[in-house]
């Protein structure tokens, strides 16, 4: 059979080989499509309800005024010329519809390095056959389930038109120290060959590099955090990030009611100052990051400095 590809909604003419160009003609067309259960016979003198789908023209060709999904199938013509010679024509018709240009919806403006992020959802509407959606990073195809890339796909079919809507949600885990402005795009590839892929407009989210927790350093003087009664402890919160974040202080998991400062001085240490201290760095662009906790404890003269403090009171320190 000769393969014919026709666009949905467009007219199609199938020639009946060997048929006399004008009536009277001895020919018949047989259809086995989505509109038939077995073979439907159409003849030149037919004319009826099937004319809206397919009708025999005066020259013996079969005319389909607007091809639909249900017209996919086999079309056969059997014709006899004036000399009684029989000729058969056999066609396999497949239909297609190119969707509108795909779009990326719900796209992220910012991604966080080192963690999974939803980049966006690619949507293609009105295709037949369904076709496929694929994602590209800086022009190169992204392979799902490789290097922190995952894709969630959904295919829906319109109940009346039979056309497909495809959705593809892209999740990525950007590498630390990678491209700060990656370019993502999505393309639709038709299910039938010989048609170019359709590509979305690209999106370029920013990649934000979170300051790793270990980089919020809490330095204690004296080292180890053990001090004699009446001594002074200096806690310094070091954050290499620029611009400098706001630093708040915590004691035993509770925020200290002090203005932000990178240095906390505890002068004239008393029992009430004992406890676990940490600092919290808050950047304007992302959430807070807490340092490791250190224990501040009092040692009586002659004692070895402990590494863990005891429960302290509610004394407040001085900010430098």
């Amino acid at each position: 059979a000769q393969n014919i590809t026709a666009r949905i909604g467009e007219p199609l003419v199938l020639k009946c080989k060997g048929a006399p160009k004008k009536p009277p003609q001895r020919l018949e067309w047989k259809l086995n499509t989505g509109r038939t259960e077995a073979w439907k016979v159409l003849s030149p003198q037919g004319g009826g309800p099937w004319d809206s789908v397919a009708r025999v023209l005066p020259n013996g060709s079969l005319f389909l005024p607007a091809v639909g999904i249900q017209d996919e199938g086999i079309f056969r013509c059997q014709a006899m010329n004036r000399n009684g010679k029989e000729t058969k024509s056999n066609y396999r018709v497949r239909v297609y519809q190119i969707p509108g240009k795909p779009e990326i919806v719900d796209s992220a403006s910012e991604l966080t390095a080192g963690v999974p992020n939803k980049v966006g959802t690619c949507v293609s509407e009105g295709s037949y056959p369904a076709g496929t959606l694929s994602w590209h990073l800086d022009g190169k195809p992204l392979v799902p389930n490789e290097k922190g890339v995952s894709v969630k796909e959904q295919t829906r079919r319109h109940p009346e038109t039979g056309l497909f809507t495809l959705q593809s949600e892209l999740m990525v885990t950007p590498a630390r120290g990678g491209d700060p402005r990656p370019t993502f795009s999505c393309s639709f590839s038709p299910g039938l060959p010989r048609h170019r892929a359709l590509r979305t407009a690209p999106i370029q989210p920013r990649v934000w590099e979170p300051v790793p927790l270990e980089e919020v350093q809490l330095v204690v003087e004296p080292e180890g955090g053990a001090v004699a009664p009446g001594g002074t402890v200096t806690l310094t919160c070091e954050v290499p990030a620029q611009p400098s974040p706001q630093i708040h202080w915590m004691k035993d998991g509770v925020p200290l009611p002090l203005p932000p400062s990178p240095v906390l001085i505890l002068p004239e240490i008393g029992p009430q100052d004992q406890g676990t201290y940490s600092c919290v760095a808050t950047h304007s662009s992302h959430g807070p990051q807490e340092s490791r906790a250190v224990s501040i404890s009092i040692i009586e003269p002659g004692e070895e400095g402990p590494t863990a403090g005891s429960v302290g009171g509610s004394g407040l320190g001085t900010l430098a």
Epitope: R35, T36, E37, K40, G47, G48, P49, W50, D51, S52, V53
Partner: antibody, heavy 119, light 107 residues
Framework: EVQLVESGGGLVQPGGSLRLSCAAS????????MTWVRQAPGKGLEWVAS????????YYPDSVKDRFTISRDNAKNSLYLQMNSLRAEDTAVYYC????????????WGQGTLVTVSS | DIQMTQSPSSLSASVGDRVTITCRAS??????VNWFQQKPGKAPRRLIY???NLADGVPSRFSGSRSGTDFTLTISSLQPEDFATYYC?????????FGGGTKVEIK
Amino acid sequence: EVQLVESGGGLVQPGGSLRLSCAASGFTFNNYWMTWVRQAPGKGLEWVASIDNSGDNTYYPDSVKDRFTISRDNAKNSLYLQMNSLRAEDTAVYYCARGGDIKVGLDLWGQGTLVTVSS
Amino acid sequence: DIQMTQSPSSLSASVGDRVTITCRASQDVGIYVNWFQQKPGKAPRRLIYRATNLADGVPSRFSGSRSGTDFTLTISSLQPEDFATYYCLEFDEHPLTFGGGTKVEIK
């Protein structure tokens, strides 16, 4: 609202003529074949004529062929039935219906208009 | 021409009854059969399209089935508003042919 409204029925003498109209609204008229169906008093339904969406092709049963003409004006969303050489047996309620091809069948009907052929 | 032989021509039934109406085509018409309901003084209303599909807004107690050239309309539990005349239609070939009708009356 999707609807069909017939008009033009009435009393006519045998041999006379009458033109029925059907006004369509609420749908894309030129996407559909259209059909006339009639129903004689106390009887069943009988197909009278069909026309394709462009108006290029018309179809009739033998009982009305050469006497009735179906036509349409897509610009006016209107369907017509010109009835000539009317006979007593043409007396019926005439319905305008959407469809008549294999894609649709007949899916929407007007309320009908009565044609009486009598002397 | 195709004949659509509809049976019975009338039947009496009670509310809640299961009612079955049949149309037999004289030749193959594929799936191209509609079923209609008509009440006195009103236009027909499509119930079933392409032999087995329920039209929009039609209660689910109505159903259509097909076996070869035999087409059946079933009302699973007859309601007071279902007392009417029912017609089948073949639209596979011209002339379009209706069945003779089945009048469903109250017993």
